[in-house]
């Protein structure tokens, strides 16, 4: 299968990095703008934290622990109201991701 | 929008005991870490200390002992500091701690003098 | 011990000119890329321009760009303004149970000409 240019493998993804407009105001979240050619069946996701496409049925039920958002050796815990989740380090360090 | 805001800073002897309060809005601290960072007059940064959203303290090795954090409530961030000295004369911040340090609030100084 | 060194300590550059800060780590950051890089200027607490080694902060130009990985770090600013004087940081993260979590480097002031 030959690929156009720009055009991405299905089943992958890769960041975005975009321009930022200085005439908005700055916004403290952290955002990351992803760009994924998923099979049927696959949203755009995080593993092993890396974009990656992942089963729909994850996003819809908002189990995100269940696409491993979190690198090997992390835990993974689900934020109230699964508003996100969080990777806790093994020293006790802990990163959020909240979805909007 | 996020903010935090520190209080408590003030002009103090050596030996005195303080505690400086974060006090946070727009953001969970059940979902989020908060550091506190300091600055002495004219030099760089120094790390003091973390407290992750489950309420698990780290601290610079220079500051065990001396330095505890604390959460107090659910938008408050304490810094206990004990025997204080001179060394410890700097502005003192805190900031959430996520994927880089990002909110800071704007710093309350402590002068420790005789 | 747990060490950041920041080189230079102080650099100058003219208007639409490039600066480059370099940032060494005594031992790896934590994944090895989990550094960011701080903007401050005199009076004002610092202000988040990169994370994760690479990420440019909302809201930051992208003349800021930030590379390297483990323990060799570098900051970037091209087309260099009058507005981006200010003193620049490194911060790294480390896994808390072997060392301190975090260290900021000395820092380098830009002064620009």
């Known amino acids: 299968q030959f690929l156009k240019e720009g055009q991405l493998a299905a089943g992958t993804c890769e960041i975005v990095t975009l321009d930022r407009d200085s005439s908005q105001p700055r916004r403290t979240i952290a955002r990351q703008t992803v760009k994924c050619s998923c099979f049927p069946g696959q949203i755009a996701g995080t593993t092993r934290a890396r974009p990656a496409c992942v089963d729909a049925r994850i996003i819809k039920t908002k189990q995100w622990c269940d696409m491993l958002p979190c690198l090997e050796g992390e835990g993974c815990d689900l934020l109230i109201n699964r508003s996100g989740w969080t990777c806790t380090q093994p020293g006790g360090r802990i990163k959020t991701t909240t979805v909007s | 929008q996020e903010q935090l805001v520190e209080s408590g800073g003030r002009l103090v002897t050596p030996g005195t005991t303080l505690t400086l309060t974060c006090t946070v809005s727009?953001?969970?601290?059940?979902?989020?870490?908060v550091s506190w960072v300091r600055q002495a007059p004219g030099k760089g940064l120094e790390w003091i200390g973390y407290?992750?959203?489950?309420?698990?303290p780290h601290y610079a090795s220079w500051a065990k002992g001396r330095f505890t954090i604390s959460k107090t409530s659910s938008t408050t961030v304490d810094l206990k500091m004990t025997s204080l000295t001179t060394e410890d004369t700097a502005t003192y911040f805190c900031?959430?701690?996520?994927?880089?340090?990002?909110?800071w609030g704007p710093g309350t100084l402590v002068t420790v003098s005789s | 011990e747990l060490d950041l060194t920041q080189t230079p300590s102080s650099v100058s550059a003219a208007v639409g000119g490039t600066v480059t800060i370099n940032c060494q780590a005594s031992q790896s950051v934590y994944n090895n890329k989990n550094l960011a890089w701080y903007q401050q200027k005199p009076g004002q607490p610092p202000k988040l321009l990169i994370y994760a080694a690479s990420t440019l902060a909302s809201g930051v130009s992208s003349r800021f760009k930030g590379s390297g990985s483990g323990t060799q770090f570098t900051l970037t600013i091209s087309d260099v303004q009058c507005d981006d004087a200010a003193t620049y940081y490194c911060?790294?993260?480390?896994?808390?149970?072997?060392?301190?979590?975090?260290?900021f480097g000395g820092g380098t002031e830009l002064e620009i000409l």
């Open positions: 900031a959430r701690d996520n994927y880089g340090m990002d909110p």
């Open positions: 727009g953001f969970s601290l059940s979902s989020y870490g």
């Open positions: 407290i992750a959203n489950n309420y698990n």
């Open positions: 911060q790294g993260e480390f896994s808390c149970s072997s060392a301190d979590c975090n260290a």
